[in-house]
C-alpha cells in the first residue's frame, strides 16, 4: 500500500477524503484530520505535519488548512440558541429559539423571526423540523375547534355533552366548543321554536 507523499502524474489521489494533490511538487499528501490543521506542509520527502486546533477553534473536515476556524456563539439577538457546543471537530450548533422560525439561511440559519399567529378556527401545520419555516395555518378538521390567535395552539375536539350526562345547547364550530346544558333546563326563548319543529 502506497503511503503519502507519493508522485501523481494525473493530478488525482487514491483517497480523496484524506489526501490532496500538491501541484508544486506533483505529489499526493495527507490531509489533516478533523480537529487539526497543517503546521508544516508536505514535501517530496516528508508528509504533512498536523497540529491540534487551539481552544475555541475547530476544523470539521479532513483538510489542508493552515489555520482552524474560530468558534462562534449562537447570537440571541438574531433569535438563535445553542443546541450543541463547539469542539475542535465541530462548530457550535444553533437553532431558532422556541416560537421562532428561520427567516435567513446561508448554509446555516443566520436570523430567526417570530412565528405568525394562526387565527381562530385554524392551527399550524405540523412540520418535520422545528424552526424550519413560518407557520402554515390549516383549518381545524371536522369536530374540532380553536378559539385563539396563537402560533402554537392546537385544534381540540368538541366536547361530547352526552359523555357528561348533558345535552347539546349549541353545536360547536371551528372557532368555538359545543355548548352543553342540563336536560332539565328549559331552552332560552329565542331557541324554543327549534324545539317545536
Amino acid at each position: 500500500q502506497v503511503v503519502p507523499p507519493y508522485g501523481s502524474e494525473n493530478q488525482t489521489c487514491r483517497d480523496q477524503e484524506k489526501e490532496y494533490y500538491e501541484p508544486r511538487h506533483r505529489i499526493c499528501c495527507s490531509r489533516c484530520p478533523p480537529g487539526t490543521y497543517v503546521s508544516a506542509k508536505c514535501s517530496r520527502s516528508r508528509d504533512t505535519v498536523c497540529a491540534t486546533c487551539a481552544e475555541n477553534s475547530y476544523n470539521e473536515h479532513w483538510n489542508y488548512l493552515t489555520i482552524c476556524q474560530l468558534c462562534r456563539p449562537c447570537d440571541p439577538v438574531m433569535g438563535l440558541e445553542e443546541i450543541a457546543p463547539c469542539t475542535s471537530k465541530r462548530k457550535t450548533q444553533c437553532r431558532c429559539q422556541p416560537g421562532m422560525f428561520c427567516a435567513a439561511w446561508a448554509l446555516e440559519c443566520t436570523h430567526c423571526e417570530l412565528l405568525s399567529d394562526c387565527p381562530p378556527g385554524t392551527e399550524a401545520e405540523l412540520k418535520d423540523e422545528v424552526g424550519k419555516g413560518n407557520n402554515h395555518c390549516v383549518p381545524c378538521k371536522a369536530g374540532h375547534f380553536q378559539n385563539t390567535s396563537s402560533p402554537s395552539a392546537r385544534c381540540q375536539p368538541h366536547t361530547r355533552c352526552e359523555d357528561q350526562g348533558l345535552v347539546e345547547a349549541a353545536p360547536g364550530t371551528a372557532q368555538s366548543d359545543t355548548t352543553c346544558r342540563n336536560p332539565s333546563e328549559s331552552l332560552p326563548p329565542e331557541m324554543s321554536g327549534t324545539m317545536l319543529m
Epitope: P34, T52, C53, A54, E55, E60, H61, A84, C86, R90
Partner: antibody, heavy 121, light 113 residues
Framework: EVQLVESGGGLVQPGGSLRLSCAAS????????MSWVRQAPGKGLEWVSG????????NYADSVKGRFTISRDNSKNTLYLQMNSLRAEDTAVYYC??????????????WGQGTMVTVSS | DIVMTQSPDSLAVSLGERATINCKSS????????????LTWYQQKPGQPPKLIIY???TRESGVPDRFSGSGSGTDFTLTISSLQAEDVAVYYC?????????FGQGTKVEIK
C-alpha cells in the same frame, strides 16, 4: 508512552471529602480536555465531569453538581477531582480519561487504570 | 440527556462465529455538516479500564483488529465482531459525544458459548 495514573481513592464516611489526582504523561496535556468517568461495582460507565484544555470550561453530571469540582494544573500535567458531601452511591472506580479534543465532548482515547472510592460508615 | 440503549444485555457466541451488538440513541447523533455520527464503542475486559475501539460510528482506532467493525447512522448503530476470538470476551459499551453530557449505553457482555 501516553499514560494516565490516578491516585487519592480510599474509604471515606458519608458526608466526607476526598481529592482525586490524575498524573498525565506522554502528550501535550494543555491541548486536550480531560474527564472523570466512574463505574460502580458490577455496573456500567457514567461520565462525572469534564474540563477543557485550558481549564476555562467545566461541566458536571447532574448527580454530582454542587458537590464535586474538577480542575487541572497544566504546569504539573495533573487533573483533579475534589469530592465533597460524599454519598454511598458515589462508591465506584473513578477513571480519568483524555479526549481527542480541547473540548471534553469527544471520544475518550486514553484511560487511566482507575482509583477505587468507597463511601461507607 | 441523550439516552443510549444497548441490546442484548449479554451474548454467548461460539469461537469463530459472528457477534452483533446493537445500540440505539434517543436522539439523532448525526451531524449533517460533516456527515459524521458522534458515536464510539469501547471494549472493557475484566479488571481493566475501557479501551476505545471505534469512533465516528465506523472508524477503527489504530491497532484494533479488522474483525471489529461499526455501522449505522442517526439513531441506530451496530458493533460487529466478524469472527469471535477468546481475547474478545469483554463488556462492550457505546457512547454518544454529540451533546453534553456524554452518555454511555448500559453495556453488553460477550461470552464464549
Amino acid at each position: 508512552e501516553v499514560q494516565l495514573v490516578e491516585s487519592g481513592g480510599g474509604l471515606v464516611q458519608p458526608g466526607g471529602s476526598l481529592r482525586l489526582s490524575c498524573a498525565a504523561s506522554g502528550f501535550t496535556f494543555s491541548s486536550y480536555a480531560m474527564s472523570w468517568v466512574r463505574q460502580a461495582p458490577g455496573k456500567g460507565l457514567e461520565w462525572v465531569s469534564g474540563i477543557s484544555g485550558s481549564g476555562g470550561r467545566t461541566n458536571y453530571a447532574d448527580s454530582v453538581k454542587g458537590r464535586f469540582t474538577i480542575s487541572r494544573d497544566n504546569s504539573k500535567n495533573t487533573l483533579y477531582l475534589q469530592m465533597n458531601s460524599l454519598r454511598a452511591e458515589d462508591t465506584a472506580v473513578y477513571y480519568c480519561a483524555k479526549s481527542d479534543n480541547w473540548h471534553y465532548l469527544d471520544a475518550f482515547d486514553i484511560w487511566g487504570q482507575g482509583t477505587m472510592v468507597t463511601v461507607s460508615s | 440527556d441523550i439516552v443510549m440503549t444497548q441490546s442484548p444485555d449479554s451474548l454467548a457466541v461460539s469461537l469463530g462465529e459472528r457477534a452483533t451488538i446493537n445500540c440505539k440513541s434517543s436522539q439523532n447523533v448525526l451531524y449533517s455538516s460533516n456527515n459524521k455520527n458522534y458515536l464510539t464503542w469501547y471494549q472493557q475486559k475484566p479488571g481493566q479500564p475501557p479501551k476505545l475501539i471505534i469512533y465516528w460510528a465506523s472508524t477503527r482506532e489504530s491497532g484494533v483488529p479488522d474483525r471489529f467493525s461499526g455501522s449505522g447512522s442517526g439513531t441506530d448503530f451496530t458493533l460487529t465482531i466478524s469472527s469471535l476470538q477468546a481475547e474478545d470476551v469483554a463488556v462492550y459499551y457505546c457512547q454518544q459525544y454529540f451533546n453534553t453530557p456524554p452518555t454511555f449505553g448500559q453495556g453488553t457482555k460477550v461470552e464464549i458459548k
